[in-house]
Each structure stands twice: as structure tokens, then as C-alpha cells.
């Protein structure tokens, strides 16, 4: 038969950061290839990554159409060298993925401090707004555009000479903090979606940036 000795995929896993979304699975193929299908709960199946020997498939283009929808994917296994034939009625083995809702489940990528500027005893710290592949009216949206006020940034800041980390929060991408005059400070930011309750609620911390280095400006 057309699917003799093919093994169904297993361990289907969604890997998604800032909506860049890849489905991964096992096993590495031996004499077989895979095709992926994706659909929303109420939609039709759409085929992607036709007859691939890879064990991953980039589904970003599909999920960004509506990041608040819940998606399901499935991976079909075919013999190597398989060619679609109109006469074949036998369904190849396949495995379903877990459901995936991008808005709730995509991981938050590591943020970046774009700049900081000191004026007297105030410092304005700006977080870079990451672009995503989510589109509205043919325009790519930033992370802030997509999440709006659901996305919080926590700023950790500390005197270069001390270890205690003060915090500030914003639901924009800007912080305005008070600092002691004549002291150098270091900064790190973390993205948080407080409404989430699982591991994807926080990003990893941004790289640390310190005053006296190139990203900063100081004005009296």
C-alpha cells in the first residue's frame, strides 16, 4: 500500500516567540516525508511544508492572520518519493498537535533597551518596540500594537556601586525614573503579560545597559 512502513509523527510541539511560530515534531525521517496541515477550530485545513524531510514547519504566515484564534495542526507521514496520486484513497498516518492560541501562548522575546537619557536627576529609558509578522491593513504591527496595555515592561535599575535592584513599570515603552545626581546606574528590562499564569508570562531579561556607555546621553 501507499503508506507501508511509514511512522506517524509524534511529540508535536509549538515553538513561538513574538508570534514567529514553528511546529516541530519527531522522528527524523527514514524513508519518509511529511506534510503539515493547519486550521482554526471552525476553518478548513490548509496544507503547508509539502513532502518535507524536515521535522519542522514555519506556520507564522497562517497564525498571524488572527492571533486570537485557536489553531490545530496535523502532520501526515508519506513514503519517501511519494507523489500525490488521484487514485489513492488510503489516508496516511498522521498526528494532531496540541491546540495553540498565539495571543495567549507565544513567548515574549528578549527585550532590548533602545536608549536612555539623563536630564538632571531624571532618566528616561526607552525599550525597543519589536516588530512582529502580524499585519493590520498591510502594515506590520509591533509587539505593543498587538498586545496593547496587556504588555507591561518592568525596569530593574541599580547604582553601579550597589547590588539592590529598584523596579519601575510601564504599559508604554518608556520609563521616567528618579536617580541620584552623580551616580552611574545600570538597567535591565523584562516584558510581562500579567494576565497570563504560565511559563510564558515573562520574557528573559534584556542585556544590561549602564550609564557611561554609548546608548546613553547625559544633559544637565
Amino acid at each position: 500500500s501507499g503508506t507501508t512502513n511509514t511512522v506517524a509523527a509524534y511529540n508535536l510541539t509549538w515553538k513561538s516567540t513574538n508570534f514567529k511560530t514553528i511546529l516541530e515534531w519527531e522522528p527524523k525521517p527514514i524513508n519518509q516525508v511529511y506534510t503539515v496541515q493547519i486550521s482554526t477550530k471552525s476553518g478548513d485545513w490548509k496544507s503547508k511544508c509539502f513532502y518535507t524531510a524536515d521535522t519542522e514547519c514555519d506556520l507564522t504566515d497562517e497564525i498571524v492572520k488572527d492571533v486570537k484564534q485557536t489553531y490545530l495542526a496535523r502532520v501526515f507521514s508519506y513514503p519517501a518519493g511519494h507523489v500525490e496520486s488521484t487514485g489513492s484513497t488510503e489516508e496516511p498516518p498522521y498526528e494532531n498537535s496540541p491546540e495553540f492560541t498565539p495571543y495567549l501562548e507565544t513567548n515574549l522575546g528578549q527585550p532590548t533597551i533602545q536608549s536612555f537619557e539623563q536630564v538632571g536627576t531624571k532618566v528616561n529609558v526607552t525599550v525597543q518596540d519589536e516588530w512582529t509578522l502580524v499585519r493590520r491593513n498591510d502594515t506590520f504591527l509591533s509587539l505593543r500594537d498587538v498586545f496593547g496595555k496587556d504588555l507591561i515592561y518592568t525596569l530593574y535599575y541599580w547604582k553601579s556601586s550597589s547590588s539592590g535592584k529598584k523596579t519601575a513599570k510601564t504599559n508604554t515603552n518608556e520609563f521616567l525614573i528618579d536617580v541620584d545626581k552623580g551616580e552611574n546606574y545600570c538597567f535591565s528590562v523584562q516584558a510581562v503579560i500579567p494576565s497570563r499564569r504560565t511559563a510564558n508570562r515573562k520574557s528573559t531579561d534584556s542585556p544590561v545597559e549602564c550609564m557611561g556607555h554609548e546608548k546613553g546621553e547625559s544633559r544637565e
Epitope: 507591561i152 523596579t167 504560565t198 511559563a199 508570562r201 531579561d205
Partner: antibody
């Protein structure tokens, strides 16, 4: 169900040390921030310090800086308050509380508290 | 550090009364203010967050408001279970600071 349970309180002499534990269940501490707050007998609430278990960052009230250390073991889902060089004025009920890290960061869940008495 | 000045320190009221407690921040704290209720021998419980948002499960007779750096907790109709001590707290900056507390007693 979210729960925080403190333990480790007791009677200790001035200059002594004590380690308090805050065991969390119903949530993962690495995804939140944990604070310690104390309340001396008949007095108000005083913030002691915090830890973000995801990165180990901490900050302390001036009254305990250099004497108290907050740590966390994410594998045990537990935060700790190590108290050294204890003074009579450290006598209080010690609470741990969860910070939801929203914009206003309220402490949405608190433990039941553990009493620390510093006396000779 | 930001000071939170709470008043009154205590008040006597009857069941059914409207009760107002205020907190003044020593500098701008935006809306990063919470209110807690504490009963003797118990841990504090969150009532209001972000100055005016009612925490889940808290009766609607509790409300919070903000005017600049002044924050108000109102109990529209005091119930027997509301006799307790109330604290405001700012968490706009580190360290977070509490008001001194207001003890609501039975008249």
C-alpha cells in the same frame, strides 16, 4: 488554589540568626515576584524586601539592608528570608506575599505569617 | 522613599454607615495604589488595586478613587465583617510603602 505558607519563626537571642521559608503552591514562583513584609506587635505593615526568582534580583528596606538576605529555590517553589544580626526591633510577624507584576503590582496573595521574637 | 499618609488613624462607625479613609502620597504615584483589609491575627487581604479596581471576590460596597496624589477607600454601607484595620500601599517605586493604617471600630 494559590497558597503561601511561612515557617521557621521562633524565639531567638539578639545577635542571633533565623531562616524563614515561604512555600508556594498553586502557582510557580519563577513567574512572579515574592515580597517579605513584617508587622511588629500592635504596629502597621513594613515592607522588608523582594526577590524576582526568575533572575535573582533583590532589594531591601534600609532597616534590614546588610543583615537580611532573600533567596529562592525555584525547584522547591520556595522563597527564603535569612535574618542575621537580629535585634529586638526585628520582633514581628513576618509575611511573604505574591506580587502579580501588573502595572500597580498589588500583593494579591499573602501567607498566614510566622512570628519572630528577638529577646534575651 | 515615598510616604503614604493615611487618615484617620482610627474611626468609630455603625453598621450601615458610609466610611471614607484617605491616603496622600508624598509624590506622584500614578494609580499604583492598593488597599488591604486586615483582621486581628490574620494576614492582610487585597481589596482594591490600581487605585480603583475591585479585586476578585471583594464585595461591591468597597470602592477606591484617586484625585492627584490623594487616594480614597470608601465602604458604602458598613457591614459587621468590615470592622478591621485598612492599609493603603503604593508600589509605583521601590521600596513599596504602606500607610500607617486605619482601625475601623464599632461605635
Amino acid at each position: 488554589e494559590v497558597q503561601l505558607v511561612e515557617s521557621g519563626g521562633g524565639l531567638v537571642q539578639p545577635g542571633g540568626l533565623l531562616r524563614l521559608s515561604c512555600a508556594a503552591s498553586g502557582f510557580t514562583i519563577a513567574y512572579y515576584v515574592i515580597h517579605w513584609v513584617r508587622q511588629a506587635p500592635g504596629k502597621g505593615l513594613e515592607w522588608v524586601g523582594y526577590i524576582d526568582p526568575s533572575n535573582g534580583y533583590t532589594y531591601y528596606a534600609d532597616s534590614v539592608k546588610g543583615r537580611f538576605t532573600i533567596s529562592a529555590d525555584t525547584s522547591k517553589n520556595t522563597a527564603y528570608l535569612q535574618m542575621n544580626s537580629l535585634r529586638a526591633e526585628d520582633t514581628a510577624v513576618y509575611y511573604c506575599a505574591r506580587d502579580d507584576q501588573s502595572l500597580s503590582s498589588p500583593f494579591d496573595y499573602w501567607g498566614q505569617g510566622t512570628l519572630v521574637t528577638v529577646s534575651s | 522613599d515615598i510616604q503614604m499618609t493615611q487618615s484617620p488613624s482610627s474611626l468609630s462607625a455603625s453598621v450601615g454607615d458610609r466610611v471614607t479613609i484617605t491616603c496622600r502620597a508624598s509624590q506622584d504615584v500614578n494609580t499604583a495604589v492598593a488597599w488591604y483589609q486586615q483582621k486581628p491575627g490574620k494576614a492582610p487581604k487585597l481589596l482594591i488595586y490600581s487605585a480603583s479596581f475591585l479585586y476578585s471576590g471583594v464585595p461591591s460596597r468597597f470602592s477606591g478613587s484617586r484625585s492627584g496624589t490623594d487616594f480614597t477607600l470608601t465602604i458604602s454601607s458598613l457591614q459587621p465583617e468590615d470592622f478591621a484595620t485598612y492599609y493603603c500601599q503604593q508600589h509605583y517605586t521601590t521600596p513599596p510603602t504602606f500607610g500607617q493604617g486605619t482601625k475601623v471600630e464599632i461605635k
